[in-house]
């Protein structure tokens, strides 16, 4: 016989990312004996919850909780049985629920209560379902990206922990209902609401973050649709040859389209709307989403929101990635520079419905929205956030890092389970057995 070293015991954590358009479940794992090391937590598995986001169940809260069952059952299989009781389970809801909470707080509470009731039925260590603030969503996304890319701290070959010299990456998240920009900055923020101070591994980070509600991809598309109905009677961002019946109630039910809502309108009325493949009019329509008229600070991004100049490298994920990846992969267009990104957006917006379908087969009608999505991403980055060609060169569009989805979920779990200590590793008390 000989001694066989057992693999280290693993710990697990589960986060339900309840976004505006859908919910995703992420299961994370890490070696139990290395809890405070960096870059040690990784994604074990994930599951997409069928149907819409939990905010779409405002009239049927039990439907929201029922939708989660399939993924929770998968979690029972994915996490070893003996680890169930010790596995923290969190649900975090983002902008879809923030919007519902604005318009119908009772419904929002009912949905959270319903999902809480279901989540407590499972043998995991359920630690709450709550709505994240835009600031939290931004910061936790930034933590995730930098944790996965090991920008906070590394273990050197000489057996010491050190802080990498490369600095941190900024993070840009484009969700369904909101978009977040977060990056480390040297000077204090002129607007205190946009600044977060973090202590990670004994290092101090001053981080700028802002979340723009109603600037997520789906809400932007709804706002552009409302504008097209109002000003054109056709949709310049949709391809020529594409037309659909638009239910007015769907367009104007969101608080994001409130400003464009006609005084008297029949919510059950359907209007036929056709596309015109007009990149220039589409650009104008998208430009109307941003206001640059007033800024109470020394500098602003848009809508009077303070933002220091973008600095350093950035990772852009979620719908930023999907949009740019569509241009690059499906359409075969270069997007390495801002100029190329703009040309790619114009290219897609010039396509007729027949041309677009031939280039990208087997797709649902959502294919018609890529022009608007591309135009919005290009305008948000260049005009909105102020990326010039040089700064844009430092932006990477990424979906995963180290086989783990980039998003706020991992950062949220790391924070709530204290997997990122505030103290530097060298100061941690322990017994030296050497």
């Amino acid at each position: 016989t000989r001694d066989v070293r057992e693999p280290p015991a693993l710990k697990y954590g589960i986060v339900l990312d309840a976004g505006s358009s859908h919910t995703s479940m992420f299961i994370y794992k890490w070696p139990a004996d290395k809890e405070n090391d960096t870059g040690i937590v990784g994604q074990h598995s994930s599951c997409d919850v069928p149907g819409g986001g939990i905010s779409s169940y405002a009239d049927n809260p039990s439907g929201a909780s029922q939708s989660l069952v399939g993924c929770l059952e998968q979690a029972l299989q994915d996490v070893p049985k003996e680890r169930h009781a010790g596995t923290p389970l969190y649900l975090g809801a983002t902008a879809g629920m923030r919007l519902l909470n604005l318009t119908n707080p009772e419904a929002s509470t009912s949905v959270l209560m319903a999902v809480t009731h279901t989540l407590t039925q499972y043998p995991f260590d359920f630690r709450g379902a709550r709505i994240l603030s835009g600031q939290e969503e931004g910061v936790f996304g930034w933590v995730t990206a930098n944790y996965l890319l090991e920008n906070f701290i590394k273990y050197g070959w000489v057996g010491r922990w050190f802080r990498p010299r490369k600095g941190t990456l900024g993070a840009m998240d484009l969700g369904g209902a909101s978009t977040q920009i977060t990056f480390e900055t040297t000077s204090p923020a002129e607007d205190r609401a946009s600044e977060v101070q973090l202590h990670l591994y004994g290092q101090h980070y001053r981080v700028y973050t802002h979340s723009f509600l109603c600037y997520g991809r789906d809400q932007v598309l709804q706002r552009l649709l409302a504008s097209a109905l109002q000003t054109h009677g056709f949709h310049p961002c949709w391809p020529r040859g594409f037309s659909t019946q638009v239910l007015l109630g769907d367009v104007y039910q969101s608080p994001c389209t409130m400003a464009q809502r006609p005084q008297n309108f029949n919510s059950s009325a359907r209007v036929s709307l056709s596309g015109s493949s007009d990149p220039h009019l589409c650009r104008d329509l998208v430009s109307g989403l941003f206001s640059f008229s007033s800024c109470p600070f020394s500098r602003c991004s848009f809508n009077g929101v303070f933002q220091p100049p973008v600095a350093g490298n950035f990772v852009a994920f979620s719908a930023f990635f999907y949009t740019v990846d569509f241009l690059r992969t499906s359409m075969g267009l270069p997007v390495a520079t801002l100029q190329q990104l703009e040309a790619a957006a114009v290219n897609v917006c010039n396509q007729t419905w027949a041309q677009l379908q031939a280039r990208v087969p087997g797709q649902r009608a959502r294919l018609a929205d890529y022009c608007a999505g591309a135009m919005f991403v290009q305008q948000l980055l260049s005009r909105g956030y102020g990326f010039d060609e040089r700064a844009f060169g430092g932006v990477i569009f990424q979906k995963k890092a180290a086989d783990t989805a980039v998003g706020w979920a991992l950062g949220y779990m790391l924070n709530l389970t204290n997997l990122i200590p505030a103290d530097p590793p060298g100061l941690r008390k322990g017994t030296d057995f050497s």
């Epitope: 997409d48 069928p50 027949a354 379908q357 031939a358 280039r359 087969p361 087997g362």
Partner: antibody, heavy 120, light 109 residues
Framework: QVQLVQSGAEVKKPGSSVKVSCKAS????????VSWVRQAPGQGLEWMGR????????RYAQKFQGRVTITADESTSTAYMELSSLRSEDTAVYYC?????????????WDQGTLVTVSS | SYELTQPLSVSVALGQTARITCSGD??????VYWYQQKPGQAPVLVIY???NRPSGIPERFSGSNSGNTATLTISRAQAGDEADYYC???????????FGGGTKLTVLG
Amino acid sequence: QVQLVQSGAEVKKPGSSVKVSCKASGGTFDSYAVSWVRQAPGQGLEWMGRIVPWLGFTRYAQKFQGRVTITADESTSTAYMELSSLRSEDTAVYYCARESPGYRYSFDVWDQGTLVTVSS
Amino acid sequence: SYELTQPLSVSVALGQTARITCSGDAIGEKYVYWYQQKPGQAPVLVIYDDNNRPSGIPERFSGSNSGNTATLTISRAQAGDEADYYCASYDLQQARWVFGGGTKLTVLG
């Protein structure tokens, strides 16, 4: 009624190339696309790439990138698929399939295929 | 990369209903296509856009798609339905058509 007619069976040596043709008889490539799909003996279907002749647009599966070239001659309504650096694992039936706008550019018309055997 | 998973084989009694599944991450968000291939023949499209039949395909063939599973249903199965069935979907992330591994349908009796 459009039919696709492919060139005949081929026997090739490892390291060489093969070029298979696919002619649309009784129709043109206007508004259509052509995909190439292969099937190794006793195996499933494997998509290789596609061309939209009227747009001059091609896409290849990553697995074949750099080794496959798909072209089309609109004047003769013929598509071609050339596979280079052949190895024994490339022995398969190669199908050309028409992608039709009526079916959201899925494969509605297939030819009987061309058997390519790679053997030394 | 995106994968579609099918059972290797499915058996059905003559005249009964056969169901062949095709699973993939959030497949319900994509359109699914089904092809029938008999030995020595080219594949034939039997279902497009999840649940539509091309002309000439019997009404006995139907499809559904939601969540992570698409299903091809063949009611009142006949001996002539014995074949390999493949599901397919277009993967936007890699700009490629993806086929499932295929399911051999056997009609018993």
